[in-house]
Interface confidence: medium
């Protein structure tokens, strides 16, 4: 007789999840010398300990203890660049501008980027049929809880500037509700943080609206102000010449606006 | 967020010339539209002179046109003014600025980082 399992709304793990993980935390010590010592087996064990036999939504962040502390990596503290909603730029940056760094850039970020997972309580399995989604079931689940550890680690580290992007073709260009807006803007330290630079980043190609007036810009503004961090904010017009520019300068299209 | 730093000014004569510059630190990687403005005593923070990211868009105050001219070096991370035909009304401590876009804006309002400033004294 099948065993009764617990239907979630949200898409099941992954398929291949622990090869994808073991393979790409190879591919990640191969290409970053700094992580060579990571002991790629190791660092599946505690990832799949974190979540395995575990209710998927009763997940803590000390289950992800374990995994943090063999994928604790140094990234300079004032090259942190954040993102909200417009994760494929912000990765697109760092691919040119390669001495800053987002979440997905270390170790950890890259290993579970893009993925999902969970287990059942009390079974080895992994549920590759469905997970819980963060709304509609609930919101200590293994991939919300990994992300919500991660992007807390990763804020507390930052120092000096730390840039972010935000998506400024969204109603709301800073979500309160985002990870950005919930978890790292809270852990950012104002005693190591001088300034958080956002960059609001445009969609029209003829919106030349100063997006940085909007006011859930002026209600993060509030906030960082209060936590005695300076804040600035940008505006890029021209996301595509932006990049090309910061990827070659002297580039004769680099004369006229971004 | 960069750091801005003046230099240049000073006491000079009036019909003399003075090069100030600002020196950007912080944010190498790109650059946005960069500002002179200045203050004298006892009146608001006026809009002296403006240039694009790339340096190839410039404005002007009325009262500076023809004399002052702004340029940068984008390879130095600096932009300068440099004020020729000065006059006693110029005497102001001058600012640097960055803008929150890429273009050469006139409005104060469109800047958002500040450098501490230099005094300028021109003498009849």
């Known amino acids: 007789v099948p065993r009764w399992r617990q239907q979630w709304s949200g898409p099941g793990t992954t398929k291949r999840f622990p090869e994808t993980v073991l393979a790409r935390c190879v591919k990640y010590t191969e290409i970053h010398p700094e992580m060579r010592h990571v002991d790629c087996q190791s660092v599946w064990d505690a990832f799949k300990g974190a979540f395995i036999s575990k209710h998927p939504c009763n997940i803590t962040e000390e289950d992800y203890q374990p995994l943090m502390k063999l994928g604790t990596q140094t990234v300079p503290c004032n090259k942190i660049l954040l993102w909200s909603r417009i994760k494929d730029l912000a990765h697109q940056f760092t691919q040119v501008q390669r001495d800053m760094f987002t979440l997905e850039d270390t170790l950890l970020g890259y290993l579970a980027d893009d993925l999902t997972w969970c287990g059942e309580f009390n079974t080895s399995k992994i549920n590759y049929q469905s997970c819980p989604d963060w709304r509609k079931d609930c919101s200590n689940n293994p991939v919300s809880v990994f992300w919500k550890t991660v992007s807390r680690r990763f804020a507390e580290a930052a120092c000096d500037v730390v840039h972010v992007m935000l998506n400024g073709s969204r109603s709301k260009i800073f979500d309160k509700n985002s990870t950005f807006g919930s978890v790292e803007v809270h852990n950012l330290q104002p005693e190591k943080v001088q300034t958080l630079e956002a960059w609001v980043i445009h969609g029209g190609r003829e919106d030349s609206r100063d997006l940085c007036q909007d006011p859930t810009i002026k209600e993060l503004e509030s906030i960082i102000s209060k936590r005695n961090i300076q804040f600035s904010c940008k505006n890029i017009y021209r996301p595509d010449k932006f990049l090309q520019c910061v990827k070659n300068p002297e580039d004769s299209s680099c004369t006229s606006e971004i | 967020q960069v750091q801005l730093q003046e230099s240049g000014g000073g006491l000079v004569q009036a019909g003399g010339s003075l090069r100030l510059s600002c020196a950007a630190s912080?944010?190498?990687?790109?650059?946005?539209?960069m500002g002179w403005f200045r203050q004298a005593p006892g009146k608001e923070r006026e809009f002296v002179a403006a240039?694009?990211?790339?340096?190839?868009?410039?404005a002007y105050a009325d009262s500076v046109k023809g004399r002052f001219t702004i340029s940068r070096d984008v390879t130095k991370n600096t932009i300068y003014l440099q004020m020729n035909s000065l006059k006693p009304e110029d005497t102001a401590i001058y600012y640097c600025?960055?803008?929150?876009?890429?273009?050469?804006?006139?409005?104060?309002?469109?800047?958002?980082?500040w450098g501490q400033g230099t005094q300028v004294t021109v003498s009849e």
């Open positions: 600025a960055e803008g929150r876009t890429a273009s050469a804006s006139t409005m104060i309002r469109e800047y958002d980082s």
């Open positions: 912080g944010r190498t990687f790109v650059s946005f539209g």
């Open positions: 240039i694009n990211w790339r340096g190839s868009t410039t």
